[in-house]
C-alpha cells in the first residue's frame, strides 16, 4: 500500500502560509484543484478550489486561501494569509478528475498555529508584515460537490486556512497508514 | 562535503542534443528539488525549470518546452538536464542548484547550493 | 512574466563605501525575492532571501530590505572581497526570473 506522508508546519498568528503541490503536468495541468482540510473522523472538506478547467497562472480567492495553478511548470500554490489558532489541522491537496476519484497530492500538511506573532525569519512569513495584499485579479470558483465511498468534498466556508504540499499523486482509495516526519525549525 | 558536480564542457553542432549530468553529494538527494538555471557569455542569470528527485515531477519555462528534459537516477544521486535542437543562442554556462527550504512543500526557492557550471557551445 | 529591472548595470565604489543596489518589479512580489553575488569563474551564492533574511555564513556587512514591487540591496562597508556581479531574483511568480546584474568594481 502507499504510505502517506505528513509534513508538519509550525506557524505564528498573523504569518502566512505559503506553499506548492506539485503534480503531474502532462496529466493534470487543466484538471481543477482543490484544497481541502480533513478533520478528525470526518470526510475531507474543500474550502477553495481552482476554476473547471483550470487556467493557468489565474488567482482564485476564496478568504484568506489564494490559489494559483501554474500550468507549465506542475505547480499549484496555495498561500493562506493572516492565519489564526483554529487554522490548525491536517491539510491536502487533491486533483478532480470525475467521474474518477480524486488524486491526491503527496503529502498532507499538519498546519499548528499557536499564539503570538514570531518576528524570527523563517518559512512562509513576510517578515513582521501581517497584511497581505491580494492580488486585484483574484476570482471566486465554485467547487463541485464531490461524494464518493471514500471522499466528501463541500462547498467553501468563510474562513479556513491553507497549505498543501508536493511529491506525486496517489488515489484515495490507496491511503493506508500515515507516517509522521520530523519538523525543521 | 555537500555539492553538487557537473559533467565536463561540451561541444555541439546546432540541431544537435546535450546533456548535461549534475551528481549530487554530502546531502539526500531525494530531500530537495533541482534547479536549472544558464548564463550565456556576458549575460545575465536564466532558470530553465525545475524537478522533484523524490517523484520526478518537473516544470519548465515556456520558452524551453519541447526542448528540454529534465530526469534522474536516484540510484546515482544524479540529475540531468537534456536540451535538444540546439541554436547558437544556446551557448551558455549550464548550472544546477538545490532549492533550499525550511518546509519540504514550502514556496521557497531559495538557491543555497549551486554546480560549478557546464560550459555547452553550440557551433558549426 | 514579472520583469525584474536591477540598477545600476555597474559602478565603482572605493573601500569602505556604502553600496547600494535596487531591484524593480513588475508587478508587486510580495517580497519573495533573493540576491545573489557571482564571482568570475564561481557559480553564485546566496546572500539574501525572502527580501531581508541574511544566508547562514554571509557577513553582516550585506543587507536587503523592499517590499512591493522596490527592493534595495546594500553592503554597508565595501570590502576587496565584494569584487563581484550581483543579481535579484524573484519568486512572487512563476516563472522565477533574475533582475540583469550589477557589477561592483573598486576604484
Known amino acids: 500500500a502507499t504510505k502517506l506522508t505528513e509534513e508538519k508546519y509550525e506557524l505564528k498568528e498573523g504569518q502566512t502560509l505559503d506553499v506548492k503541490c506539485d503534480y503531474t503536468l502532462e496529466k493534470f495541468a487543466s484538471s481543477q484543484k482543490a484544497w481541502q482540510i480533513i478533520r478528525d473522523g470526518e470526510m475531507p472538506k474543500t474550502l477553495a478550489c481552482t476554476e473547471r478547467p483550470s487556467k493557468n497562472s489565474h488567482p482564485v480567492q476564496v478568504g484568506r486561501i489564494i490559489l494559483e495553478d501554474y500550468h507549465d511548470h506542475g505547480l499549484l500554490r496555495v498561500r493562506m494569509v493572516n492565519l489564526q489558532v483554529e487554522d490548525s489541522g491536517l491539510y491536502q491537496c487533491v486533483i478532480y478528475q470525475p467521474p474518477k476519484e480524486p488524486h491526491m497530492l503527496f503529502d498532507r500538511i499538519r498546519l499548528v498555529v499557536t499564539k503570538g506573532f514570531s518576528g524570527t525569519p523563517g518559512s512562509n512569513e513576510n517578515s513582521t508584515q501581517n497584511v497581505y495584499k491580494i492580488p486585484p485579479t483574484t476570482t471566486k470558483a465554485l467547487c463541485p460537490l464531490y461524494t464518493s465511498p471514500r471522499t466528501v468534498t463541500q462547498a467553501p466556508p468563510k474562513s479556513t486556512a491553507d497549505v498543501s504540499t508536493p511529491d506525486s499523486e496517489i488515489n484515495l482509495t490507496n491511503v493506508t497508514d500515515i507516517i509522521r516526519v520530523p519538523v525543521f525549525n | 562535503q555537500v555539492q553538487l558536480v557537473q559533467s565536463g564542457a561540451e561541444v555541439k553542432k546546432p540541431g544537435a542534443s546535450v546533456k548535461v549530468s549534475c551528481k549530487a553529494s554530502?546531502?539526500?538527494?531525494?530531500?530537495?528539488?533541482i534547479n536549472w538555471v544558464r548564463q550565456a557569455t556576458g549575460q545575465g542569470l536564466e532558470w530553465m525549470g525545475w524537478m522533484n528527485p523524490n517523484r520526478g515531477n518537473t516544470g519548465y519555462v515556456k520558452k524551453f518546452q519541447g526542448r528540454v528534459t529534465m530526469t534522474r537516477d536516484t540510484s546515482i544521486s544524479t540529475a540531468y538536464m537534456e536540451l535538444s535542437s540546439l541554436r547558437s543562442e544556446d551557448t551558455a554556462v549550464y548550472y544546477c542548484?538545490?532549492?533550499?527550504?525550511?518546509?519540504?512543500?514550502?514556496?521557497?526557492?531559495?538557491?543555497?547550493?549551486w554546480g560549478r557550471g557546464t560550459l555547452v557551445t553550440v557551433s558549426s | 512574466d514579472t520583469q525584474m529591472t536591477q540598477s545600476p548595470s555597474s559602478l565603482s565604489a572605493s573601500v569602505g563605501d556604502r553600496v547600494t543596489i535596487t531591484c524593480q518589479a513588475s508587478?508587486?512580489?510580495?517580497?519573495?525575492l533573493n540576491w545573489y553575488q557571482e564571482k568570475p569563474g564561481k557559480a553564485p551564492k546566496l546572500l539574501i532571501y525572502?527580501?531581508?533574511n541574511l544566508e547562514t555564513g554571509v557577513p553582516s556587512r550585506f543587507s536587503g530590505s523592499g517590499s512591493g514591487t522596490d527592493y534595495t540591496f546594500t553592503i554597508s562597508s565595501l570590502q576587496p572581497e565584494d569584487i563581484a556581479t550581483y543579481y535579484c531574483q524573484q519568486y512572487g511568480n512563476l516563472p522565477l526570473t533574475f533582475g540583469g546584474g550589477t557589477k561592483v568594481e573598486i576604484k
Open positions: 508587478q508587486d512580489i510580495f517580497n519573495d
Open positions: 554530502g546531502y539526500t538527494f531525494t530531500s530537495y528539488d
Open positions: 525572502h527580501a531581508s
Open positions: 542548484a538545490r532549492r533550499r527550504a525550511v518546509y519540504r512543500s514550502s514556496w521557497e526557492w531559495y538557491f543555497d547550493l
